[in-house]
């Protein structure tokens, strides 16, 4: 039975040029985490692998860095990277887990705009 | 198994810069993170800054950014710290390690940085 | 910054009995916690990470707890080579940062 949950940093934005950390934790389980990928839509980012490290995907190299912890950086970034986000845990005995980010990279100014006006 | 292996001790003047390295073995060295860490006599350890060989991406603590820069050399597997506008303040031990998983997990002996004025 | 904070700087403990080390976080940290041990003259040695997953080669009388932003790291049945100085690590977020050290005294 998996008792596992995955907490993650839910809907996110950004700024266009800037970067972005993105954040799962699994928790609720003693299964044994062995590797966590790093998808958007279908598209592998980054895998973490317990014993190998990390693997970037080449489309992605220059502008994505591990960490920190098993979460990922994304730098430089375009309004094309808005979307949906996912970490992918591999556990045993349990499986896998999926968690997802929604992150929205806004234009500088609108960015700007709407943090003038955010609730403290 | 991974190993780290750190340059020797320096003696430097006060105000000069000084430039030390830790090459990597036993492992992929564009997969992992790199960090560097100080230690104080008689104190504890404060992390300096990270970077990934993959793509030199770096993280600095607040008080060193402008002062250290961390470098990679992927084709010997070496990382170099760089600092900067020595003090008396920076003798310290300088330590390199590996982020393995969810731990740092292999360190380099350190590399003693003494400053004298 | 996290701030990780290890009250005690030195503990005083016998061979045979149980010793807890504690560490606090200034903000959630969830488990995101590493714990080091540093014999005189070393470089650190990993014990613990996700706070209470042991690294390869640990002894099972060293036991890592908490989350949050309390954590402990128990060594029951110490030894004498457990003589060192232990610090408790976070990365949640950038800066990484560390506690200040507890020193363990064998009497």
């Known amino acids: 039975m998996m008792t596992g949950t995955i907490e993650t940093t839910g809907n996110i934005s950004a700024e266009k040029g800037g970067s972005i950390i993105l954040q799962c934790h699994l928790s609720s389980t003693t299964a044994q985490v062995t590797q966590v990928n790093w998808e958007q839509q279908d598209q592998l980012l980054a895998i973490c692998n317990a014993d190998l490290g990390w693997h970037i995907s080449p489309s992605f190299k220059d502008r994505v860095a591990p960490g920190p912890g098993l979460g990922l950086t994304l730098q430089s970034l375009t309004v094309n990277d808005t979307g949906e986000y996912f970490c992918i845990y591999h556990t045993y005995p349990d499986g896998t887990y999926t968690g997802r980010i929604f992150l929205e990279v806004l234009e500088s100014s609108v960015a700007e705009h709407g943090a003038r006006f955010q609730i403290p | 198994q991974a190993y780290l292996q750190q340059s020797g001790a320096e003696l430097v003047r006060s105000g000069a810069s000084v430039k030390m390295s830790c090459k990597a073995s036993g492992y992929t060295f564009t997969s992992y993170n790199m960090h560097w860490v100080r230690q104080t006599p008689g104190q504890g350890l404060e992390w300096i800054g990270s970077?990934?060989?993959?793509?030199?991406?770096?993280n600095y603590i607040q008080k060193f950014k402008g002062k250290a820069t961390l470098t990679t050399d992927t084709s010997s597997s070496t990382a170099y710290m760089q600092i900067s506008s020595l003090t008396s303040e920076d003798s310290a031990v300088y330590f390199c390690a590996r982020e393995g998983w969810l731990s740092l997990d292999y360190w380099g002996q350190g590399t003693t940085l003494t400053v004298s004025s | 910054d996290i701030v990780m904070t290890q009250s005690q700087k030195f503990m005083s403990t016998s061979v045979g009995d149980r010793v807890s080390v504690t560490c606090k976080a200034s903000q959630n940290v969830v488990t995101n916690v590493a714990w080091y041990q540093q014999k005189p003259g070393q470089s650190p040695k990993p014990l613990i990470y996700s706070a209470s997953y042991r690294n390869s080669g640990v002894p099972d009388r060293f036991t890592g707890s908490g989350s949050g932003t309390d954590f402990t790291l128990t060594i029951s049945n110490v030894q004498s080579e457990d003589l060192a100085e232990y610090f408790c690590?976070?990365?949640?977020?950038?800066?990484?940062?560390f506690g200040g050290g507890t020193k363990l005294e064998i009497k």
């Open positions: 970077i990934y060989p993959g793509n030199d991406g770096t």
């Open positions: 690590q976070q990365y949640k977020s950038y800066p990484y940062t």
